[in-house]
Interface confidence: low
């Protein structure tokens, strides 16, 4: 049986919030609590953007904030993959990328983030309230999925700009000694809590847990903390899912040779426009699912030939070939 633990993702600060400094003393303990609980816990962020130039064109960007190695990324729409969602793209760090209409261009932006451009018209066109989900399978963390959609009132071409991440990427955390800072923060938090002992503590709501408890990990937060931070898994039902895709793949994956566009995919003409790794922008909602490999029945990542990183981000395929320069 698959074990799922719901963990809230950290949202970026809302731009233009006034009086934030005045509330710092109230906010600080909760920020520290969140950091203490989520320390070492992977996060997935999703950003959905509608292009101003083409109203039926969407850009989905997803990233994994974790220290593990990513073995597979699955992008779906209409709900989480395996729960009514339709697969749009599968990105494997060693073995390539598969995409299905209306996905136009799926690519790696960094070792831990991907982007996907969708375009379409009529039945295969995404619409404003479509839910897009990204699932990152990593080792040893397991599978983590996040979903996002455009905010209802969003203007074409506008989504919250990727905010510089207020939290450090987990793979850099160890290097930068964030663990020490968090430890200090946790101690400070305990100190604050002891000072405010006289205040009644908010009652914890029991969390929805699956029958099988998650396998314990050294950095796993306590049950109480998990309960305190638990958020329900949110998905948006949409009427925009393409019937053409649903009928094309009764077995879960579309018949890619039947549904793919015949024209060549448009390629970005340069390195990724987004240099920093953002966390979810406004208008995106995030939910995270964790399934350990042993429990989810997933494979550990394949270890193939030694991989090398290349200075030219476009690679040789910008001008030629399936094996070379396009």
């Amino acid at each position: 049986m698959r074990t799922e633990a719901q963990v809230p993702a950290l949202q970026p600060p809302e731009p233009g919030l006034e009086g934030a400094m005045g509330h710092r003393t109230l906010v600080l303990p909760w920020v520290l609590l969140t950091l203490c609980v989520t320390a070492g816990t992977p996060e997935v962020w999703v950003q959905v953007r509608m292009e101003a130039t083409e109203l039926s064109s969407f850009t989905i960007r997803c990233g994994f904030l974790g220290s593990g190695s990513i073995s597979l990324v699955t992008v779906s729409w209409g709900g989480p993959n395996g729960a009514g969602g339709t697969t749009l793209a599968v990105l494997h760090p060693e073995r390539g990328i598969r995409q299905w209409a209306p996905a136009r261009q799926a690519r790696w932006e960094t070792q831990s983030s991907i982007s996907l451009i969708l375009e379409g018209s009529g039945a295969s066109s995404p619409c404003a309230n479509t839910t897009f989900c990204c699932k990152f399978a990593s080792f040893p963390e397991g599978s983590w999925e996040a979903c996002g959609s455009l905010p209802p009132s969003s203007d074409p071409g506008l989504s919250a700009p990727p905010t510089p991440a207020p939290i450090l990427r987990a793979d850099l955390a160890g290097i930068l000694g964030v663990s020490g800072v968090l430890l200090f923060g946790c101690v400070y938090l305990l100190h604050l809590l002891r000072r405010h002992k006289h205040r009644p503590a908010p009652r914890l709501q029991p969390s929805r847990t699956s029958p099988q408890a998650p396998r314990a990990r050294a950095w796993a937060p306590s049950q109480a903390s998990q309960a305190a931070l638990h958020v329900p898994y949110a998905t948006i039902n949409t009427s925009c899912r393409p019937a053409t895709l649903d009928t094309a793949h009764p077995h879960g994956g579309p018949s890619w040779w039947a549904s793919l566009p015949t024209h060549a995919a448009h390629r970005p003409q340069g390195p990724a426009a987004w240099a920093s790794t953002p966390i979810p922008a406004r208008g995106s909602f995030v939910s995270v699912e964790n399934g350990l490999y042993a429990q989810a029945g997933e494979r550990p990542p394949h270890t193939g030939p030694g991989l090398t990183l290349f200075p030219d981000p476009r690679g040789p395929r910008a001008m030629e070939g399936p094996l070379g320069v396009r």
């Epitope: 390539g96 890619w256 995919a265 030939p305 990183l309 396009r326």
Partner: antibody
Framework: QVQLVQSGAEVKKPGASVKVSCKVS????????MHWVRQAPGKGLEWMGG????????IYAQKFQGRVTMTEDTSTDTAYMELSSLRSEDTAVYYC??????????????????WGKGTTVTVSS | DVVMTQSPLSLPVTPGEPASISCRSS???????????LDWYLQKPGQSPQLLIY???NRASGVPDRFSGSGSGTDFTLKISRVEAEDVGVYYC?????????FGGGTKLEIK
């Protein structure tokens, strides 16, 4: 570990078609980029075509354009290569091979790192 | 198409001795990112080909370190520092810079 299991030997008459299958195990087909390579008796290797993940399309070598069709059944994790209008010079061993992927990012470079055992196709009248 | 030419056609070697196979391409396989898009494969008798070297000089997983690839542009070499009996077979170079990828004619390594 990826494994590719190919269908058995075929004997065909000139003008007929042959469909060779390649079953993937250890991974799902959607995680791989499948290529097909053939080898005529006593001759070298010849790339016929393969899946191009950047386009999401299959690309065929010019020589086989119009005669070859490469398809996949994701429900059974099986890839197929169909060659039509067979001639005697199509007598060969046909291999399926997965295209390895070197590095993430916007970089797509392929090498055939896992091969099937091959399917012998004999075209004879 | 890029034409790949291998030499020698046949290479008899004594076990323990070194061996060298040459591969020449009709156009440069060096791309602006500094990589040479050339791979080496070995096809042992009665078997499928197996990847030995990719990107000119990178050994594939599980390949013994007695195999090494070198060269740049149009001239490439596969070296075996000490040939063993299990190394017999036909060695192919393949260019991966342009579509379609093309293979050399092969070099048959045999034990003396």
């Amino acid at each position: 570990q990826v494994q590719l299991v190919q269908s058995g030997a075929e004997v065909k008459k000139p003008g007929a078609s042959v469909k060779v299958s390649c079953k993937v195990s250890g991974y799902t087909l959607t995680e791989l980029s499948m290529h097909w390579v053939r080898q005529a008796p006593g001759k070298g290797l010849e790339w016929m075509g393969g899946f191009d993940p950047e386009d999401g399309e299959t690309i065929y070598a010019q020589k086989f354009q119009g005669r070859v069709t490469m398809t996949e059944d994701t429900s059974t994790d099986t890839a197929y290569m169909e060659l039509s209008s067979l001639r005697s010079e199509d007598t060969a061993v046909y291999y399926c091979a997965t295209g390895g992927y070197s590095s993430g990012f916007n970089y797509y470079y392929y090498y055939m790192d896992v091969w099937g055992k091959g399917t012998t196709v004999t075209v004879s009248s | 198409d890029v034409v790949m030419t291998q030499s020698p056609l046949s290479l008899p070697v004594t076990p323990g001795e070194p061996a060298s196979i040459s591969c020449r391409s009709s156009q440069s396989l060096l791309y602006r990112n500094g990589n040479n898009y050339l791979d080496w494969y070995l096809q042992k008798p009665g078997q499928s080909p197996q990847l030995l070297i990719y990107l000119g000089s990178n050994r594939a997983s599980g390949v013994p370190d007695r195999f090494s690839g070198s060269g740049s542009g149009t001239d490439f070499t596969l070296k075996i520092s000490r040939v063993e009996a299990e190394d017999v077979g036909v060695y192919y170079c393949m260019q991966a810079l342009q579509t379609p990828p093309t293979f050399g004619g092969g070099t048959k390594l045999e034990i003396k």
